[in-house]
């Protein structure tokens, strides 16, 4: 990896990087690795002993559009014999993601990064038990 | 791109798509704040299929660190706390963005990146193959 | 106003245990990971091992490997630094300091003011 | 591990002096930072990232440097300047600091 050279700062010297307003970054929108593929095992969400389902929730002034949440399907978790074990729990695994937001202020447009939080699947956990004295 | 509704009383000159460059403010909104409580982050101890978490650091993404999930055993923990090897612990697997410094080292300019990464382990039942 | 402040000095026999908190505030405490460095006497400075208060995820240092557990709580906001099987070479000024997991080329920013632990028999 | 090497251990300096402490790792790292120390108190990020001042730090102070090789210079030494300075690297792990360098008034 490329290491700066002596009297420049950690960043290029401005002139070597694109011009860019106070106050905002640059951000070009065509996704590196765009194509790539989750190879996940088949169908996990409904081999998982802490099934889910997916939701797609669609904003058009959101960029990606789609994001998809995953929910789990049971309190409990599924035992060998597929019923539902309430001594566990079917908790929710979380990610963070960024999108991109267009905003509309009148007849101008803003656009605001969002740090947003996906739902991508469900675990199966031995409760916590907190002991009333 | 995607289509964006549009003010009817606004010129007709802006494109509907997302445009390939924007410019964005600094900072950053967290959509993050108000979320459930009860979320825990002792869940990759207490799952049947637990996992342990390895720190990846690149100074030229943005977040530069990212904790990804390695599945402790191929098989699940049962009832009695060993592994079960008539079971699989598998990773969840997640496409994100991040921003990717480019150029490199340019404080201000960034492009969207998409990568993969593995959030948790799950407990699931095999498939099993026959041979015929 | 960002502040890190740990808990008091501690005194220890070889083979015990301590635990060390560091209460953080003024700042969104998951979006920062705490590192510990510790400070023997009249000595340079030593790197411990990293907590991420939002994932859990923990790394050490070999050499602590097995004897430093570090934790965090993200209801109070408070991280925690536990030493085992202690031995008067632990004898020194623990220290928490804060990482951004988004831009890491800041490094660690804020410090705690130490937490001094002397192992003695 | 990485060990980096810092030099001189310690330095006798004169208020308005030009004073250079250099610090050498043993493979190659990417940025270096510097923190300042003074007796009884915690260590302080002086300069991050090889080149970038830390708020609140006079720009009489400067980093420089690449691979093995880094710096931290004072152009002129003002009294609030004496203290150990320590150089760190977070490129490999374990993450590693320098032995100090003390600065003291001759």
């Known amino acids: 990896r490329k290491i700066p050279k002596v009297g420049h700062t950690f960043f290029q010297k401005p002139e070597s990087c694109p011009p860019v307003p106070g106050g905002s970054m640059k951000l070009d929108i065509g996704i590196i690795n765009e194509n790539q593929r989750v190879s996940m095992s088949r169908n996990i969400e409904s081999r998982s002993t802490s099934p889910w389902n997916y939701t797609v929730t669609w904003d058009p002034n959101r960029y990606p559009s789609e994001v998809v949440q995953a929910q789990c399907r049971n309190l409990g978790c599924i035992n060998a014999q597929g019923k539902e074990d309430i001594s566990m729990n079917s908790v929710p695994i979380q990610q963070e993601t960024l999108v991109v937001r267009r905003k509309h202020q009148g007849c101008s447009v803003s656009f605001q990064l969002e740090k947003v939080l996906v739902t991508v699947g469900c675990t199966c956990v031995t409760p916590v038990i907190h002991h009333v004295q | 791109g995607i289509t964006i509704p549009r003010n009817p009383g606004c010129p007709n000159s802006e494109d509907k798509n997302f445009p390939r460059t924007v410019m964005v403010n600094l900072n950053i909104h967290n959509r993050n704040t108000n979320t459930n409580p009860k979320r825990s982050s002792d869940y990759y101890n207490r799952s049947t299929s637990p996992w342990n978490l390895h720190r990846n650091e690149d100074p030229e993404r943005y977040p530069s660190v990212i904790w990804e999930a390695k599945c402790r055993h191929l098989g699940c923990i049962n009832a009695d706390g060993n592994v079960d090897y008539h079971m699989n612990s598998v990773p969840i697997q997640q496409e994100i963005l991040v921003l990717r410094r480019e150029p490199p080292h340019c404080p201000n300019s960034f492009r969207l990146e998409k990568i993969l990464v593995s959030v948790g382990c799950t407990c699931v039942t095999p498939i099993v193959h026959h041979v015929a | 106003e960002v502040q890190l402040v740990q808990s008091g000095a501690e005194v220890k026999k070889p083979g015990s245990s301590v635990k060390v908190s560091c209460k953080a505030s003024?700042?969104?405490?998951?979006?920062?990971?705490i590192h510990w460095v510790r400070q023997a006497p009249g000595q340079g400075l030593e790197w411990i091992g990293v907590n991420d208060p939002e994932s859990g995820g923990t790394f050490y240092n070999q050499k602590f490997d097995g004897r430093a557990t570090l934790t965090a709580d993200k209801s109070t906001s408070t991280a925690y630094m536990e030493l085992s099987s202690l031995r008067s070479e632990d004898t020194a000024v623990y220290y928490c300091?804060?990482?951004?997991?988004?831009?890491?080329?800041?490094?660690?920013?804020?410090w705690g003011q130490g937490t001094t632990v002397t192992v003695s028999s | 591990d990485i060990q980096l090497t810092q030099s001189p251990s310690s330095l006798s300096a004169s208020v308005g002096d030009r004073v250079t402490i250099t610090c050498s790792a043993s493979?190659?790292?990417?940025?270096i930072y510097w923190f300042q120390q003074k007796p009884g108190k915690s260590p302080k990020r002086w300069i991050y990232?090889?080149?970038e001042l830390a708020s609140g730090v006079p720009s009489r102070f400067s980093g420089s440097g690449s691979g093995t090789d880094y710096t931290l210079t004072i152009s002129s030494l003002q009294p609030e300047d004496f203290a150990t300075y320590y150089c760190h690297q977070r490129s490999s792990y374990p993450w590693t600091f320098g032995q100090g360098t003390k600065l003291e008034i001759k």
């Open positions: 003024g700042y969104t405490f998951t979006d920062y990971e």
């Open positions: 300091t804060r990482y951004y997991r988004y831009e890491s080329f800041y490094g660690m920013d804020y």
């Open positions: 990232a090889t080149f």
């Open positions: 493979s190659s790292i990417s940025y």
